[in-house]
């Protein structure tokens, strides 16, 4: 059985205020069973950016259909970027557990920074 890898290809992503940013994340295995969540930052202070299972994340859309059984692309788009959105974003795989899911593996992170201002 292939060991799961979390691939975030961009180390740095330059974004423009007011525009949409695409954060890429793919996995190399469907196992273990469990959701992929997005966070900004690490440790206890990290900010939840997207959870497919619960919550309402109006500025976030997924690139692929996460409901498809064999989906391995967990990339997201964040619309209407502001300066407060800068930081390093991580896609994180959780292993299904009871009563709570357990963090299994994190991607290496993509740093989002502000690039050129809109003209």
């Amino acid at each position: 059985e292939e060991e799961l890898q979390m691939i975030q290809p961009e180390k740095l992503l330059l974004v423009t205020v007011g525009k949409t940013a695409t954060l890429h994340c793919t996995v190399t295995s469907l196992l273990p069973v469990g959701p992929v969540l997005w966070f900004r930052g690490v440790g206890p202070g990290r900010e939840l950016i997207y959870n497919q299972k619960e919550g309402h994340f109006p500025r976030v859309t997924t690139v692929s259909d996460l409901t498809k059984r064999n989906n391995m692309d967990f990339s997201i788009r964040i619309s209407s970027i502001t300066p407060a959105d800068v930081g390093t974003y991580y896609c994180v795989k959780f292993r299904k557990g009871s009563p709570e899911n357990v963090e299994f593996k994190s991607g290496p992170g993509t740093e989002m920074a502000l690039g050129a201002k809109p003209s």
């Epitope: 990290r46 919550g55 407060a84």
Partner: antibody, heavy 119, light 108 residues
Framework: DVQLVESGGGVVRPGESLRLSCAAS????????MNWVRQAPGEGLEWVSR????????DYAESVKGRFTISRDNSENTLYLQMNSLRAEDTAVYYC????????????WGLGALVTVSS | ETVLTQSPATLSVSPGERATLSCRAS??????LAWHQQKPGQAPRLLIY???NRATGIPDRFSGSGSGTDFTLTISSLQTEDSAVYYC??????????FGGGTKVEIK
Amino acid sequence: DVQLVESGGGVVRPGESLRLSCAASGFSFSSYAMNWVRQAPGEGLEWVSRINSGGGGTDYAESVKGRFTISRDNSENTLYLQMNSLRAEDTAVYYCAKQYDWNGFFDYWGLGALVTVSS
Amino acid sequence: ETVLTQSPATLSVSPGERATLSCRASQTVGSKLAWHQQKPGQAPRLLIYDATNRATGIPDRFSGSGSGTDFTLTISSLQTEDSAVYYCQQYYYWPPYRFGGGTKVEIK
């Protein structure tokens, strides 16, 4: 329906402590950042503190830094504000407010809890 | 820190008339501006977010416009129940979250 209900307000003397609670229902509490906002009698709104969805990230207004502590219990859907070393200028109605997303406005407000600091 | 200045401080308008409230930011906040309504003795209520979007359940007589530093809340045909204080809030730069000083709308 989203509901936020504050409790724990009252009359205290300068230097004393008080803990406010905010019971949340009608939404996935653990997915959202939460805030405390206060309003002194006859005055405008003043943001006090913010806590991220997981509870490990906090921010405070300069006026309360070092005296107030925000926390949350996601298993109980409850937000807290521990207020120490209270001053007369802390007299206000304290509102808990839900944040629309991790970097957003306040989309739901509680009814408020009155805190009076007087000798 | 971004400062929000609301004007006028008080606005007296007859029922059925248009009310225009202004909120000016000391630096750009893009479209990241919300308007909240607070009636006497009540908690604030979200009216408008992202400068122009009406919140759920808000009547269409309320509209928001503007971007950058200058924003307007318009009540197209004032009703008696619109008597309240209106606050703008920016969420482009934070912390801290900032509110304007408020505009009190009175019924003539």
